[in-house]
């Protein structure tokens, strides 16, 4: 048995007569043989669920669900209740109604076995019938909404009449009907004004019925019509078995470059027309098991269940359903030497499904794990300026497909063929598994004998120690020019274009700093600043070379304070700045300030 509503509303007036009928509560059956029996909770409750007093005023007919006053609620009774309401004015009280034998203990009141009946209290006597508006004669102030379980026997779930009005104003004629489309499963009995279902409902066909209740009031010669929404929601039960959309029960996957733990290798989708179990219960009651295969597969893969509500069209309306994505996920990083093919089976069980048929599906994943061989191009041939400063980035080495790698740890090393010309260094970038080539020793760059640098690049997979090699030829270009005296170590210190471009700084590939002119649009990512190379600094990312020394690009790498209009970078540096940003790495400070508009004019004049 279950209530067709979780809450009911009615009005209470001072000195309303004992015996006044208040309202009906309705229960619907889960099985044809069930007979409802109603019981009232012992207490009246007030604001914030405060227990006010034992209920001495309202009774229920156990078999019909009729609530009525068995004792008039006078002023003194009301005062007594108000005192206990934690100092709040008492405007509403409620009672709990239970369905016996569903719940014999008065605790939490939860649908379906308990409903709350709210009474709005009016500190006046019942108004004169002639003063009542048609709306007040027809419907309670709070609009009702109904819950009906699918596949259950039909039954009565509502009674339209406002009983106190009918009882106290017998001369006013009130008639009701339901406006509904053809073939809907509801009827309103003209004599009893009871609304019932004609047949069992199927949520998978229709989940919501937005009906309209029409009330016609006859008072003397006057006739008025009032319409209110009459919404019915059909509640789901697990009566649909899981299925494969388009019959797809197999997914094939190749594991090659993405070998990192938590990588989703393949996904299979299961459709269930039901939306139960509810999300809290779903993963416990809708189980997926990776069936025992070889130990390696059990250790290497896991299945993740990702349920999602969706909506599907049924008979011209949309009803909710569930799609379950089952993702085959790597449980660990896979070595590049791993090479095997297997079929994995996953058993999905909708454990609440009662049939007919089985609530079980078997998912198949065909997985090929391919080995990755490390390849480098046979040669790289790059150039570097003889004026380049330490940490200048001059190139990138990358094993074949390195940008696609994840979970593969490749380290790059340089082996120089000329001991005295070991100018370059390499650092491995974790983001794209590449190696960034940079100037490590500027003195060697200036030696006449070091006009061409010869290296062997060695890429090593850390897990398997497999290697790939490439020849790296670097020509040293141009002539060396000593820089101006008094230039700072970091390009970022310079606040003006002129002083920026006449100096070099750490990380500068040309031996000169570059000025980046901003767009002047408030706090912007494109702020004006002085940089060793605008290709890499600032770009909102402190790269693996820039981490070597804070003087290279504090705009991207500073962890200190930024003064002025800015947006901080994640996790460091300046994401956006106002005007011109310059930095003092030693002091761990950057300043973003409005552009000095007079400055370029002055520079031109002073030339």
């Amino acid at each position: 048995l279950y209530f067709s509503r979780d809450a009911y509303w009615e009005k209470l007036y001072v000195d309303q007569a004992a015996g006044t009928p208040l309202l009906y509560v309705h229960a619907l059956r889960d099985a044809p043989e069930e007979v409802p029996s109603f019981r009232l909770g012992q207490h009246l409750y007030g604001t914030y669920r405060t227990r006010l007093h034992e209920n001495n005023w309202i009774c229920i007919q156990e078999d019909t669900g009729l609530l009525y006053l068995n004792r008039s609620l006078d002023h003194s009774s009301w005062e007594k209740l108000s005192v206990r309401n934690r100092g709040f004015p008492l405007l509403t009280v409620y009672l709990k109604v239970f369905l016996s034998p569903t719940s014999l203990r008065e605790g939490e009141c939860q649908w379906p076995g308990c409903a709350r009946v709210y009474f709005s209290f009016f500190n006046t006597s019942f108004p004169a019938c002639s003063s009542l508006k048609p709306r007040e004669l027809c419907f309670p102030e709070t609009r009702p909404s109904f819950r009906i379980r699918e596949n259950r026997p039909p039954g009565t779930f509502h009674q339209f009449r406002l009983l106190p009005v009918q009882f106290l104003c017998p001369n006013i004629s009130v008639a009701y009907r339901l406006l509904e489309g053809e073939g809907l499963p509801f009827r309103c009995a003209p004599d009893s004004l009871e609304v019932s279902t004609r047949w069992a409902l199927d949520r998978e066909q229709r989940e919501k019925y937005e009906l309209v209740a029409v009330c016609t009031v006859h008072a003397g010669a006057r006739e008025e019509v009032v319409m209110v929404p009459f919404p019915v929601t059909v509640y789901d039960e697990d009566d649909s078995a899981p299925t494969f959309p388009a019959g797809v029960d197999t997914a094939s996957a190749v594991v090659e470059f993405k070998r990192k733990e938590d990588t989703v290798v393949a996904t299979l989708r299961v459709f269930d027309a039901d939306v139960v179990p509810a999300s809290g219960e779903l993963v416990r009651r809708y189980t997926s098991t990776l069936l025992p295969g070889d130990t390696w597969a059990q250790q290497t893969f896991r299945v993740e269940h990702w349920p999602n509500e969706t909506s599907v069209q049924a008979n011209g309306s949309f009803v909710r359903a569930t799609v379950h994505d089952y993702r085959l996920v790597l449980n660990r990083n896979l070595s590049i030497s791993e090479n095997r093919t297997m079929q994995l089976a996953v058993l999905v069980n909708d454990s609440d499904f009662q049939g007919p048929g089985a609530g079980v599906l078997l998912l198949h994943f065909n997985v090929s794990v391919l080995p990755v061989s490390l390849h480098l191009p046979s040669t790289y041939s790059l150039s570097v300026s003889r004026r380049a400063r330490r940490f200048a980035q001059i190139g990138k080495v990358c094993v074949e497909n390195c940008q696609a790698f994840s979970g593969i740890n490749v380290q790059y090393k340089l082996h120089s063929s000329g001991a005295n010309c070991s100018t370059l260094g390499v650092v491995t970038s974790a983001e794209d598994t590449s190696g960034i080539l940079f100037v490590n020793d500027t003195k060697a760059l200036r030696r006449p004998k070091c006009a061409e640098l010869h290296y062997m690049v060695v890429a090593t997979d850390q897990q398997t120690s497999r290697q790939a090699q490439a020849q790296l030829l670097v020509t040293v270009e141009g002539s060396y020019v000593a820089e101006e005296a008094g230039c700072p170590l970091s390009c970022a210190v310079s606040k003006r274009r002129l002083e920026c471009e006449e100096c070099g700084g750490l990380g500068s590939p040309t031996g000169r700093c570059e000025w980046r002119q901003g767009d002047g649009k408030g706090i912007t990512r494109n702020f004006s600043t002085c940089s060793p190379s605008t290709k890499t600094c600032p770009d909102g990312h402190c790269d693996v070379v820039e981490t070597q020394d804070i003087n290279i690009c504090p705009q991207d790498c500073l962890r200190g304070s930024i003064v002025g209009g800015h947006e901080p970078g994640e996790p460091r540096g300046i994401k956006a700045g106002y005007g011109t940003c310059n930095c003092f790495p030693e002091e761990e400070k950057c300043f973003c300030e409005p552009e000095d508009i007079q400055d370029p004019l002055c520079d031109e004049l002073c030339r």
């Epitope: 040669t379 790059l382 300026s385 080495v397």
Partner: antibody, heavy 117, light 110 residues
Framework: EVQLQQSGPELVKPGASMKISCKAS????????MNWVKQSHGKNLEWIGL????????NYNQKFRGKATLTVDESSSTAYMDLLSLTSEDSAVYYC??????????WGQGTSVTVSS | DIVLTQSPASLAVSLGQRATISCRAS??????????MHWYQQKPGQPPKLLIY???NLESGIPARFSGSGSTTDFTLTINPVEADDVATYYC????????FGGGTKLEIK
């Protein structure tokens, strides 16, 4: 297969400027510096300059400073040469050529530029 | 700039014979333990093609009939034996100081 595909022939008026493109394929574009060479009258070869596509750093033959500007677009693996304030002296075939050691191992097919009023 | 002078300006050789082309630099082009001299072949309507790099290293795909030698200021390209397909203009190039090319030697078959 390494290929350097240059833009088509150009006829330009004196004083105008123009841009020649060189699209690289078949190798890692940022792994090799790019050279540009001028050949006049089907004979004299002159080195204009080079650019490292990774960082955009250039080195010019002093003679071509102010005449040629080298740039790259890493996303399309394309090198560009802007020729400025053209005169009849600039009529020639221009080549892009991949850097190999100090030599040039792969060459584009050449772009013929004729400067004439 | 270092000036490269090629000789002869043109050369006619019988098929199967040896062809020798000389390239003289106005100053030394040695550096880092090797000489920075390279040789190219150019056929009409085509771009130059690298034959020899760093004085004596044969570029991949080039027949062993081509060889290079020399040091400091005097360098030689030898083709032995000459084949009909070798008809072309040959250029030397140095890079000890910037990069300059020789004036070219035109090879013909006698």
């Amino acid at each position: 297969e390494v290929q350097l595909q240059q833009s088509g022939p150009e006829l330009v008026k004196p004083g105008a400027s123009m841009k020649i493109s060189c699209k690289a394929s078949g190798y890692s574009f940022t792994g090799f510096t790019m050279n540009w060479v001028k050949q006049s009258h089907g004979k004299n070869l002159e080195w204009i300059g080079l650019i490292n596509p990774y960082n955009g750093v250039t080195n010019y033959n002093q003679k071509f400073r102010g005449k040629a500007t080298l740039t790259v677009d890493e996303s399309s693996s394309t090198a560009y040469m802007d020729l400025l304030s053209l005169t009849s002296e600039d009529s020639a075939v221009y080549y892009c050529a991949r850097h190999y050691s100090f030599a040039m191992d792969y060459w584009g097919q050449g772009t013929s530029v004729t400067v004439s009023s | 700039d270092i000036v490269l002078t090629q000789s002869p300006a043109s050369l006619a050789v019988s098929l199967g014979q040896r062809a020798t082309i000389s390239c003289r630099a106005s100053e030394s082009v040695d550096g880092y333990g090797s000489s920075f001299m390279h040789w190219y072949q150019q056929k009409p309507g085509q771009p130059p093609k690298l034959l020899i790099y760093r004085t004596s290293n044969l570029e991949s795909g080039i027949p062993a009939r081509f060889s290079g030698s020399g040091s400091t200021t005097d360098f030689t390209l030898t083709i032995n034996p000459v084949e009909a397909d070798d008809v072309a203009t040959y250029y030397c190039q140095q890079n000890s100081e910037d990069r300059t090319f020789g004036g070219g030697t035109k090879l013909e078959i006698k």
